[in-house]
Interface confidence: medium
């Protein structure tokens, strides 16, 4: 189920695009293997922009959170709402856009790294372990701050990008979050769009490096949604 996802507080306060969908919108890449979106299949497109009903933040896109559309509205009717930018009011981390977190009711930049080593991250495995099947289960994992005295090298476990050495960012990769290289020109990237995919981001890529942006590969314009590739290209 989609309840078995990374705790939104742990993932949405990361630098972009780490709170984001790792696959290309509309492709199976954005969902956990074998896990379907609620009320739809994992190949659904994201071109329909109607409000997306939700029960939890995890069911919303990278730049959204789940809440009642009206203040003090019916708690039973919740939809995915646009995330709050820096200095906007918030009640929890998930309300703030990627790269920010909620501090004293205001969205502030997570670059300040106030709570290094203090976050208890909920890593929920959606791939059955030795005692279960694909139904998934929840498990609390506290990553000790002792692990982060030295900057993480490529492939080492991390909580956030500041745990990683220069040129690396902290991104989820299948079972854990690890330090991955910031993307170079021509490398495959993930295009984040409004109303992003509503699934478990089981893989994440770093963002494109300085002077680059993530755009659709020229020869893939005709490709179907599920196979189209985006690459880092010069502005």
């Amino acid at each position: 189920t989609l309840n078995s996802v990374l705790n939104s507080n742990a993932i949405k306060n990361l630098p972009p695009p780490l709170g984001g969908a790792a696959g290309h919108p509309g492709s199976a890449v954005s969902a956990a293997p074998g896990i379907l979106y609620p009320g739809g299949n994992k190949y659904q497109t994201i071109d329909n922009y109607q409000p997306y009903p939700c029960a939890e933040d995890e069911e919303c896109g990278t730049d959204e959170y789940c809440a009642s559309p009206t203040r003090g509205g019916d708690a039973g009717v919740q939809i995915c709402l646009a995330c709050r930018k820096r200095r906007k009011r918030c009640m929890r981390h998930a309300m703030c856009c990627p790269g920010n977190y909620c501090k004293n009711g205001i969205c502030v930049s997570s670059d300040q790294n106030h709570f290094r080593g203090e976050i208890e991250e909920t890593i929920t495995e959606s791939f059955g372990n030795d005692h279960s099947t694909l139904d998934g289960y929840s498990r609390r994992t506290t990553l000790s701050s002792k692990m982060y005295h030295t900057k993480g090298q490529e492939g080492s476990v991390c909580l956030r990008s500041s745990d990683c050495a220069s040129g690396l960012c902290c991104a989820r990769h299948f079972w854990s979050k690890i330090c991955k290289p910031v993307l170079k020109e021509g490398q495959v990237c993930t295009k984040h769009r409004r109303k992003g995919s509503h699934g478990l981001e089981i893989f994440q890529r770093c963002y494109c490096g300085e002077g680059l942006s993530c755009r659709i590969q020229k020869d893939h314009h005709q490709a179907s949604n599920s196979s189209r590739l985006h690459t880092c290209q010069r502005h």
Partner: antibody, heavy 118, light 111 residues
Framework: QVQLVESGGGLVQPGGSLRLSCAAS????????MSWVRQAPGKGLEWVSV??????????YYAASVKGRFTISRDNSKNTLYLQMNSLRAEDTAVYYC?????????WGQGTLVTVSS | DIALTQPASVSGSPGQSITISCTGT?????????VSWYQQHPGKAPKLMIY???NRPSGVSNRFSGSKSGNTASLTISGLQAEDEADYYC???????????FGGGTKLTVL
């Protein structure tokens, strides 16, 4: 530099047991997920199992072909990964590689041969 | 069971370019833009050459490149050299019980 050295392979009869070890050095072992991948003689690679970076209560995953028979474990204080193999079958005959699961299998050991035969 | 299909062998002359294909389904390679390629010389351990479709780990020659379209991924080796002669395996992630899938391998012969 990163080094992974497997040991514990050998000849065992069907139904028997064997415990493989993988000694890791050159990196912070406790910060990485670790996997076992095997390769039957003259055949391709087959993923066997993976364990998370924590040593106590670490989440583990297994390929369907070995689930219930093999157990992966690790001792971070000794920088060592283990694979306990029970109820061995002829089809388990292979070179078993220990691999660091960073960005995919980014470092491999040289492998240890397990032969299951009567 | 081999989940990803590769040609059993390919060959090329020094200096030439060759491409090795790897075909899967929408449940594995086609559904995830996360394809890796490994090189394995006889009697040696595999070595990661490409990850995330077209990313090279540090230390891997830029003669090696990866791409993907639909359910098929490709590894291209340009300026073929004698030391490139080896077996090459593709790897992807998959839905279902098998989380990691490999191709059957392709033997590259440098003529």
């Amino acid at each position: 530099q990163v080094q992974l050295v497997e040991s514990g392979g050998g000849l065992v009869q069907p139904g028997g047991s064997l415990r493989l070890s993988c000694a890791a050095s050159g990196f912070t072992f406790s910060s990485y997920w670790m996997s076992w991948v095997r390769q039957a003689p003259g055949k391709g690679l087959e993923w066997v199992s993976v364990i998370e970076h924590k040593d106590k209560g670490g989440t583990t995953y297994y390929a369907a072909s070995v689930k219930g028979r093999f157990t992966i474990s690790r001792d971070n204080s000794k920088n060592t990964l283990y694979l306990q193999m029970n109820s061995l079958r002829a089809e388990d005959t292979a070179v078993y590689y220990c691999a660091r699961h960073g960005i995919d299998f980014d470092h491999w050991g040289q492998g240890t041969l397990v032969t299951v035969s009567s | 069971d081999i989940a990803l299909t590769q040609p059993a062998s390919v060959s090329g002359s020094p200096g030439q370019s060759i491409t090795i294909s790897c075909t899967g389904t929408s449940s594995d390679l086609g559904g995830y833009n996360y394809v890796s390629w490994y090189q394995q010389h006889p009697g040696k351990a595999p070595k990661l050459m490409i990850y995330d479709v077209n990313n090279r780990p540090s230390g891997v020659s830029n003669r090696f490149s990866g791409s993907k379209s639909g359910n098929t991924a490709s590894l291209t080796i340009s300026g073929l050299q004698a030391e490139d002669e080896a077996d090459y395996y593709c790897q992807s992630y998959a839905s279902g019980n098998t989380k990691v899938v490999f191709g059957g391998g392709t033997k590259l012969t440098v003529l």
